[in-house]
Interface confidence: low
Amino acid sequence: MGSRRGPWPLVWAVLQLGWWPGWLLDSPDRPWSPLTFSPAQLTVQEGENATFTCSLADIPDSFVLNWYRLSPRNQTDKLAAFQEDRIEPGRDRRFRVTRLPNGRDFHMSIVAARLNDSGIYLCGAIYLPPNTQINESPRAELSVTERTLEPPTQSPSPPPRLSGQLQGLVIGVTSVLVGVLLLLLLTWVLAAVFPRATRGACVCGSEDEPLKEGPDAAPVFTLDYGELDFQWREKTPEPPAPCAPEQTEYATIVFPGRPASPGRRASASSLQGAQPPSPEDGPGLWPP
């Protein structure tokens, strides 16, 4: 029984010492508990807000809380204060003290931190009567970094995203341009083909049978090989010269189902699914 209860006083003592380390550091007659000022080290980017928290271990009836900065000459400059439930801002309104709802914690903030705000900060509590002594918190260090120096730690991710966006943009624009060019090419080819179709085939007085007339007669399309010039031109191709049977070459287009006239013309009534012409069919649509 006694051996079981043995550790508990020790545990209780350790817990008490852990909760109140100030008891070990301060003289027994000091009427306050230590202040805490956190974080011990704070790094913010230029232009960001820097916030420390000053915490009282207890809430005395009457006290004043000061916020100090330690100057390079080891002098303290008062930044702001809290007393009698009101904030006393300092000369620089960027330094703000805010009491949190629990009454024990105070946020001490630098609004839009500047590079020269880097330094050592602390808070101090003045306990008014009957406990008329001053307590200072441990020091805390603020580092304000340049805005241009901070992004490199984060910039490796944005540039890939940026390059990815550019890459996508380039691909997209290229695709659109290629598509537009293909459409222009197709339009050009169709413009070269269909005007002859709408006007009818070139009737040159050849020995071919006359074109059929009537509702059941399908139009016959004739492709002049010499008109299929795929070199880029700034001007539109000239209209075809007057028919000269002995100077006109025709492309042979083979459609399955009905044989085309050998080397002359293909009937549109046999359009059931074009197949590429075989080499023996004569000159193809594409120049060599």
């Epitope: 000061n66 100090y68 330690l70 080891n74 002098q75 303290t76 400059d77 008062k78 204060a81 007393q83 006393e88 300092g90 000369r91 602390l122 101090g124 001053i134 200072e136 918190s137 441990p138 020091r139």
Partner: nanobody, 117 residues
Framework: QVQLVQSGGEVKKPGGSLRLSCAAS????????MGWYRQAPGKQRELVAF???????NYADSVKGRFTISRDNAKNTVYLQMNSLKPEDTAVYYC??????????????WGQGTQVG
């Protein structure tokens, strides 16, 4: 090292007024928060009034509205104007210069004390 020299103390009847002065040596007076403390016989020393280097003031509840603390950095002097004196104001008044040093511990200097009442 800062030396504080007090003046202005004397016996006053209740309801009277008195002005205490505390002159500090050296040119670093402006970096100190200044305060007036008092200690009555058999009692603990207590803070009466306090003025920061920025001019913010604090007063003990018992003297609010009657005492006024001020400082003149050009003259390295802090003042305590006491009006409507009461019997309980009788005590030895001490001038204090206080700041937080490089070790984050309190650096404090005291005057020789002035009897009031």
């Amino acid at each position: 090292q800062v030396q504080l020299v007090q003046s202005g103390g004397e016996v006053k009847k209740p309801g009277g007024s008195l002005r205490l002065s505390c002159a500090a040596s050296g040119s670093i007076f402006s970096i100190y928060d200044m305060g007036w403390y008092r200690q009555a016989p058999g009692k603990q020393r207590e803070l009466v009034a306090f003025i920061t280097r920025g001019g913010s003031t604090n007063y003990a509840d018992s003297v609010k509205g009657r005492f006024t603390i001020s400082r003149d950095n050009a003259k390295n002097t802090v003042y305590l104007q006491m009006n409507s004196l009461k019997p309980e104001d009788t005590a030895v008044y001490y001038c204090n210069a206080d700041r937080v040093g490089a070790t984050m511990r309190r650096v404090s200097y005291w005057g020789q004390g002035t009897q009031v009442g």
